[in-house]
């Protein structure tokens, strides 16, 4: 399956906190958006191929990396403002 | 805009070729093919946007109807871990 | 028909800088990845990297760093790559070759090739 | 960089005989292998993709197989116009890396 930690997280003003994803589906791509209450999924990054990584709609403020395929982890800096949301983590082959 | 899938089950031996459509009266902008393990949460498999539209993914073949109001996806020389419940969404 | 149309032959001294184009045609060009690839006289291929001609992105192989730069022009359908302070190690014959977004597709078609040979 | 061990370097074969050339890899990269024929002048061409993909207008005397880090590419019935160069490349993993070759000549 696809595994993603913590489940919540609080970030002291000015910190960069990372959230994990871990798969073991042997997927290829992997994503990870954003929801804010209410509204849809937005994209914040995707990659397709270990190595290699792509800005999403809103990238600011976030950064990953992709060094083993089972892995994308995603970064949120403190240079995103505004946080507070709930972060998804999908695949795909 | 309610997508009827066909066949609802399929079962097959290991190596033949399978085919699955997705039809609607309604046209969209775009339909996403999923699977599905026992389990476990859909996981995306494509997104077909433009009528006509194929995309190959392996041994998956996706078309999208010239009207966008069909799809259907083919499996060529089927193996085991295809097994699964394949889902259309758009 | 998928074709991907290289310029010409480069004669080219050490030093130098030299720019190669490879024009699209019979597919949606921001559609797919474009690769370049090198092969030197009598041997095996390397790749150098890829241009998503959608977003720009670009991905290198790190041995080709600051030896090539990847561009596009999306209006004429035209990839590029600019290779510079020549030597004789770049003469070669380079590809370039275009694979699907998604999935993440090896090369299907290629270029015809563009000869380099750089010489004093 | 995954490194690719293709065997052998050269083959001279007759017509009607087997040929199988293999391509290892150091790391498991799944069925992300992909293989090439390219005759002298030519560019590469794609005969199979990820998954033993048999690519459109191959012939069928052409086989691939493999998962993980061994893999096999396999002409059947070797015919006169089957005299080529041939690369594995893996697209598990970037950079994309090729095998260093394997020529195919006629006995």
């Known amino acids: 399956g696809i595994t993603q930690s913590p489940k919540y997280l609080f970030r002291k003003e000015g910190q960069n906190v990372t959230l994990s994803c871990e798969q073991n589906l042997n997927h290829d791509a992997m994503y990870w958006y954003r929801q804010d209450p209410g509204q849809g999924l937005r994209l914040i990054y995707y990659s397709q191929i270990v190595n290699d990584f792509q800005k999403g709609d809103i990238a600011e403020g976030y950064s990953v990396s992709r060094e083993k395929k089972e892995s994308f982890p995603l970064t949120v800096t403190s240079a995103q403002k505004n946080p507070t949301a709930f972060y998804l983590c999908a695949s795909s082959i | 805009q309610l997508l009827e899938q066909s066949p609802q089950f399929l079962s097959i031996q290991e190596g033949e070729n399978l085919t699955v459509y997705c039809n609607s009266s309604s046209v969209f902008s775009s339909l996403q093919w999923y699977r599905q393990e026992p389990g476990e949460g859909p996981v995306l498999l494509v997104t077909v946007v433009t009528g006509g539209e194929v995309k190959k993914l392996k041994r998956l073949t996706f078309q999208f109807g010239d009207a966008r109001k069909d799809s259907s996806l083919h499996i060529t020389a089927a193996q085991t871990g295809d097994t699964g419940l394949y889902l259309c969404a758009g | 028909e998928v074709q991907l149309q290289e310029s010409g032959p480069e004669l080219v001294k050490p030093g130098a800088s030299v720019k190669m184009s490879c024009k699209a045609s019979?597919?949606?060009?921001?559609?797919?990845?474009m690769h370049w690839v090198k092969q030197s006289h009598g041997k095996s291929l390397e790749w150098i990297g890829y241009?998503?001609?959608?977003?720009?992105?670009?991905n290198y192989n790190q041995k080709f760093k600051g030896k090539a730069t990847l561009t596009v022009n999306k209006s004429s359908s035209t990839a590029y790559m600019e290779l510079r302070s020549l030597t004789s190690e770049d003469s070669a014959v380079y590809f370039c070759?275009?694979?699907?977004?998604?999935?993440?597709?090896?090369?299907?078609?290629w270029g015809q090739g563009t000869s380099v040979t750089v010489s004093s | 960089d995954i490194v690719m061990t293709q065997s052998p370097a050269s083959l001279s074969m007759a017509i009607g005989e087997k040929v199988t050339i293999r391509c290892i890899t150091i790391?498991?990269?799944?069925?992300?292998m992909n293989w090439y024929q390219q005759k002298p002048g030519e560019p590469p061409k794609l005969l199979f993709s990820?998954?033993?993909t048999l690519r459109p207008g191959v012939p069928s005397r052409f086989s691939s197989s493999g998962y993980g880090s061994d893999f096999a590419f396999t002409i059947e019935n070797m015919l006169s116009e089957d005299v080529a160069d041939y690369y594995c490349?893996?697209?598990?993993?970037?950079?994309?890396?090729f095998g260093a070759g394997t020529k195919l000549e006629l006995k």
């Open positions: 070759a275009r694979s699907t977004v998604v999935p993440f597709y090896a090369m299907d078609y």
């Open positions: 019979g597919y949606t060009f921001t559609d797919d990845n």
């Open positions: 241009i998503n001609p959608n977003n720009n992105h670009t």
């Open positions: 790391t498991d990269i799944d069925d992300d």
């Open positions: 990820e998954g033993n």
């Open positions: 490349l893996q697209s598990d993993n970037l950079p994309l890396t």
